[in-house]
Structure formats: C-alpha cells, structure tokens
C-alpha cells in the first residue's frame, strides 16, 4: 500500500503569505512574484554572483512537528549557469545549503545561525544556461531530503546562499504515514512511519467482525516502513465458525449451510440425515434417531447404530462351539462395525444361570471383534450355554438400546471316564474305566496314556475299543501316571483324571493282587 503524506509546510500553496525571515535583512534572498498560466507564483530568489563572499540566509517560519518523527523536504528550484554571467563571475556558485533547527518555541525574528544543523548541500541536476534564460525556458530541479528523528515541538528550515543565482519555487515539508489497511481479514490502523530507515515499526492488526486468529496461528501483524509502505505481513485472521469470507468481510453461512471451525473454506451444505440449519450455523443437528460420534467431522452425514447381526449359528464340537454370523443388514451408515460376544451358562439341575466369561476361552478377545466368527472352548459337559453377539458402531454408545442376536447350545461332550486299578503285578497294571451308558455309543475308541512318575520326557499311548487294558513291561515298585480319554467323531472327549498307580515290589509277591 502506497504511503500517505501529511504536509506540514507548503510554500507554493501559501501564495506568498508565509513571510519568511531573511538574513541579513534587505540583502540576499528576496520574495518575488511571477505570472505562470495566468496564476501568480511566488519564489524566493538570490543572485549576488558578482560580489564575493556571500552568506545569505532564508529561514522558514516555525513549523509545528505534531506527530511526525521523520520529515521529508521537497525542494523545487532553478540555478543559473555561472558561465552565463560576464567574466564567469569568479565568486559565482551553483549550489546552496539546507539547514534545520529544532525548538520547543518560536524564536520569532531572533535568528541565530549557530542553532542550525546542516542537512545537505543542494546541487542542481540541471542548470539554466543563457539561451534557456533568454527564451524564458528555465530548468526546474526537484530534490528531496529527509531528517529524523525529530523530538522537539517544532522546527525551522533555513537555506544558505553562498553566491549562487537561485530561485526557490517550492518548499514542501511533510511526513509519511502507513495508511489504514484491510488485509487478511485484519484491520491495520493508520500508522506514523518510523524515523529510522533500517527499522520497521511492528503494528498489530485486529480481526474484522466474525473473524478470529486460528488456534495455534499467529496474531496478524504488519510492518510500517519509513516510506509509509506496509511490508512483511505476518499471521492472519480467518472467518469464525458459522461465517465465510466474502471479499474483505466475514458473512454468516446461509440457512442450510454450516461451517464448523475457523478456516479458509467456505460454508458447506448440511450433510445427509441432518435438519436444515439456521443462518450462521456451526453444525447441522442430526435428525431424530441419527447421531454424530465425538470423533465424526461435522461434514459427515449423521448415522445410527447398526441392526443386529443378520444370522447367527452355533455349532458344537465336543467342548467347543463355533459361532458364526453375518453382518447387520443396516450398517447405520457407518463402516466402523465391531462385534461383542457374551456368554451365559445355565446349570440344568437348578436352572440357575450366570455369566461364564471367566470359565470359557475365546479364540480371540470377544469384545471389539471385526471378524464374523469366533470359537469358544473349555465348555463344561451337560451345561446349557447362551451366546449373545452384539453389533456396535461409533454411535452405539449414544443410545441405550442394543442390537444383538442370541444362540443357545447344550454341551453333550462325553464325561471323563472313571478309572480304576483292577490288578497289578511287579511289571503290569490292569486298568478299567466306565462312562455313562447313554454316551458309550458315541465313543469309537479309548486312548490310554501312561508314563513313569517323575519322567516327563517320554510317555506311552495305547488305544482300545474296550473298557479295560493291561499295561505290560513296567518296572517293579514304580508309580505310573495313567490317563484315559474317549475319542468321538467330534474329536477328543473329556480326559479322565491323571491317576497314580504303583506296580508291586519284587518282595511283595502275590500276582495281580490289589
């Protein structure tokens, strides 16, 4: 943005009314009037080129500084070529000096050279030669200087002539401001330009109505340069939730639209399964029966809990059950469906029921399942089990109702065989077992496992269709661990206890005695 100039002194615009002080009085600088384009123009001129050693001063009136820190001085002037005078005027000069003095009060006609500080020697870019002058075609020069920082209430400028032929047509003194600005939805106030050329004044902006600094974002700032230009924008404002950017302002979202956070994006149309929103909405409320999970973006359609798993089967295999189900027919509009399996066991004799999570084993953790099957093992014989499979999604926790399907199964795994020691010798053990008659038809073989007590590295296995076996080639006076397991079409039935049976010692004669 272009700098704004605030004029403190404009000689050309004053129409000769300023009454500047000349020193020495009546010599040197003189106020003259000319007509240009039918308008009177005023100038201060001096042209004592023939006399040597000139020291002619022209001092402005006292200028009130106000808020200026650095002032700019624009001079428009002409200088005649020393060669256009007879003999080249040996004392003739083609430059003049510019001075200033600060003060807190107007000294009036009390002029003291020593109070003035030189700003610069002003030299023309172009000098007016004789031919130009005769043709009334003068070469106008424009020079600009700046001074700062100023600290007193006001100041004077002074022009020192040291023997030139100069006409001062315009003296304009001004300071610069960075203009009021709207940028990035932030308002920056009009700001006085700083006084030091290398430094930039940092200016805080304020967000326009309904705009905010985004979380974690930087506050809007700009830098006002010495020349009144805004530079280096930092940070920005964004239209707050419920508002969108229209040109340099934030405008409320139209009905049926929403914006859920401060961002650069425009308002969005309300998603599916939401109610029409009012003006300036930050979100769109869900229709009855539809919900939004805490982590759901506001742009996502509202969703609902799923229906129950569509189809559930429980297939018993001995002391295991495989549960299989199909996904709900209605997903509720979400893809984050998980399943939870719970188990209840009922004791047939008492009809009493209770949870069985502690006594059964699942093939994988039964809560938060993403697959549609699970195997449950360690089920007890002659127990009735009811399994519940619940389907849940991200909004299930927002309602009290549950979507589940149940399946019941009775475990009819064979009971563990009851094992007895029928007889023994020094080298053999005769073992028999029984299971309840209704279960015997399901057993196709029995497996007898035995090993020496204390020897966990090796064991022996015997299979038989009958209800007894004699284990031979055993060591005398030795304890053996014996276990019997029924084998059924579904796999292994429950194993018996591990029994400890001891062969006879050689001195304890008696064959097959118990």
């Amino acid at each position: 943005a272009q700098g704004k100039e605030v004029v403190l002194l404009d000689f050309a615009a004053a129409g000769g009314e300023l009454g500047w002080l000349t020193h020495p009085y009546g010599k040197g600088w003189d106020l003259m009037q000319n007509i240009m384009n039918d308008m009177p123009i005023y100038m201060y001129s001096v042209c004592n080129v023939m006399s040597g050693d000139q020291d002619n001063w022209l001092r402005t009136n006292w200028v009130y500084r106000g808020e200026a820190e650095r002032i700019f001085i624009e001079l428009k002037f002409t200088v005649r070529d020393c060669n256009s005078f007879p003999g080249g005027a040996s004392s003739c000069k083609e430059t003049f000096n510019l001075y200033y003095a600060e003060s807190d009060l107007d000294y009036g006609t009390n002029f003291q050279k020593r109070l003035f500080t030189k700003i610069d020697t002003i030299a023309p870019d172009e000098i007016t030669v004789s031919s130009d002058f005769e043709a009334r075609h003068v070469k106008l020069n424009v020079e600009e200087r700046s001074v700062g920082p100023l600290t007193r209430k006001g100041f004077y400028l002074a022009f020192q002539d040291i023997g030139a032929c100069v006409a001062l047509l315009s003296v304009r003194v001004y300071y610069k401001k960075c203009p009021e600005l709207l940028q990035g939805l932030a308002h920056f106030p009009e700001t006085i330009a700083g006084s030091d050329a290398p430094s930039l004044a940092t200016v805080a902006g304020t967000c326009v109505d309904h705009a905010v600094v985004p979380p974690g974002g930087e506050e809007p700032r700009m830098h006002c340069a010495v020349d009144g230009e805004w530079l280096v924008p930092i940070g920005q404002c964004l239209c707050q939730a419920g508002y969108e950017k229209v040109e340099d302002a934030c405008q409320a979202c139209s009905p049926g639209f929403f914006k859920f956070e401060a961002s650069e994006s425009p308002c969005l149309e309300c998603p599916e399964h939401t109610l029409p929103s009012p003006e300036g909405a930050t979100s769109c409320e869900c229709e009855e029966g539809f919900f939004r999970a805490p982590q759901d973006p506001a742009s996502m359609p509202c969703t609902r809990p799923p229906s129950a798993p569509h189809y559930l089967t429980a297939v018993g295999m001995g002391a295991k059950v495989e549960l299989r189900w199909t996904p709900p027919q209605d997903s509720g509009g979400r893809e984050d469906i998980v399943y939870s399996v719970t188990c209840e066991q009922c004791w047939p004799e008492s009809g009493e029921c209770g949870p069985c999570e502690a006594s059964v084993r699942y093939s994988e953790p039964p809560h938060g399942l993403t697959r549609t099957s699970v195997t449950v093992s360690d089920l007890e014989p002659h127990m009735n089990y009811t399994f519940t499979v619940e389907a849940r999604n991200g909004v299930s926790g927002l309602v009290t109702s549950r979507s589940f399907r149940t399946a019941s199964v009775s475990i009819n795994q064979t009971e563990p065989p009851k094992v007895r020691l029928e007889g023994r010798s020094t080298t053999s053990l005769s073992v028999s077992w029984s299971i309840p008659p209704p279960q015997q038809s399901r057993v196709w073989k029995y497996e007898v496992t035995y090993r020496k007590k204390g020897d966990s590295n090796s064991y022996n296995v015997r299979r038989t269709e009958g209800f007894s076996v004699t284990l031979d080639d055993l060591a005398p006076d030795t304890t053996y661990l014996v276990q019997v397991q029924a084998l059924t079409q579904e796999g292994q039935g429950a194993g018996s206890k591990v029994h400890e049976f001891q062969t006879l010692s050689p001195e304890g004669s008696g064959n097959l005695a118990v």
Epitope: P416, L421, R424, L429, K453, G454, S456, T479, L481, Q483, A494, G495, S496, K497, V498, H499, E500, F501, Q502, T503, L504, V514
Partner: antibody, heavy 130, light 108 residues
Amino acid sequence: QVQLQQWGAGLLKPSETLSLTCAVYGGSFSGYYWSWIRQPPGKGLEWIGEINHRGSINYNNYNPSLKSRVTISVDTSKNQFSLKLSSVTAADTAVYYCAKPLRPHCTNGVCYSGDAFDIWGQGTMVTVAS
Amino acid sequence: SYVLTQPPSVSVAPGQTARITCRGNNIGSKNVHWYQQKPGQAPVLVVYDDSDRPSGIPERFSGSNSGNTATLTISRVEAGDEADYYCQVWDHSSDHVVFGGGTKLTVL
C-alpha cells in the same frame, strides 16, 4: 482323631535359621507325606515341601523356589517332623503351618500325590527383623 | 510352573449362591481341593477330589471341575461363610503342590 502340635522360635534376625517342629498325635505316622505350608501376612498359602518315611528311607520333595534353603526331617520314634529354613530374610516373615494329607500316599497300588490336607497345625508366626 | 488363577473377591447376598472359580491349564485332569480360612485361623478343607466333602462340611458346599476351570459353589450363603477360599492341586510336571491366590468371599 489325629492332631498336629507345632512349636519353634517366633523371632529371628536376618541370616539366621528358622527351626520348627510338628508332633503328630492320635494316628499313624508312616505312609503319609507330611507337609509344611506358610502364609505371609495378608497373602496366600505357599507350599514349602513334604517328607514321607518309608522303610528306612526318607522321601523329600521341596518347592523349587525354596529348595536351596529348606530341609525337612523326621523323627519316627517321636512321631515328629521338622522344618529348617536357612539364611532367612524379612521376606520369610509368615505364619508357618504343618499339615497332614487326607489319605496315605499309596494304598493297594493307588497313590495320591498332592492329596488334600485335612488336618492342620495351629500355626506359628515367625517374624524376621533386625 | 503351573499357575492357578482365582478372582480376588466375590460378593453375594445372604441366601444366594456364590461361585468361586479356579482356572488352570487342563485343570479337569487334576483333582482339585478347596479350603476355607477365616481370619486368624488355620485353613479348613471343605471339598476334595473336585466334589467330595469331608465329614462335618454342610451339603451347601459343592464343587465341579472340567476343561480349564474348577468351581466351588456355596448355595444358600450364610454370614458365617464369609472367609478366604483357596484351591489346590498337584502339578504332575514339577511334582509339587500348587495353591491358587485365594478369593475373599464377602456376604453383603
């Protein structure tokens, strides 16, 4: 009816040896595996080990976590068995119990390792503190 | 080594049924024994060989054992049943006695 009476020092310093004795009254001594069990304050039961005197041989079995420091011995003439636990520390502070199994170890070829304990001594509180 | 896991606590109202579980790998193949211990007293055997009761123990105490779980069931619970309960087995692999961590039964 079998009874177990136990005694021994109740206060020990670290590195000393714990020594307890349990006398069996009113029942058979041989054929059983006699056990020692302890219970630290506010904690559960921990089996220390067992002994069975058969013929002229003592059969010992100890909890692996204590095996290097434990000795269980028997005096059949007095129907007594004893526990020694060496190099005690504060972690050995507990109530120590002697216990009798429900059944003799082997009867007619059927053996009962780790049988249920149907009779317990009154317990001895042993504190290890410096 | 063989580990027996019991719930630290079970609460039940008088007259209701309490079930205390003892979980261990293939515990069904082992004989499980249960003890009751009241504060300051030695443990008392209440069930042996999974489900048998010593003389003097009420019929309200019963046990079962299959798969990986043994259960002590106390029906018609009374205030006097409030105690710590421990399960115990013999581990044939290491040849030593193993106790469960114990369950505190609270009668509400």
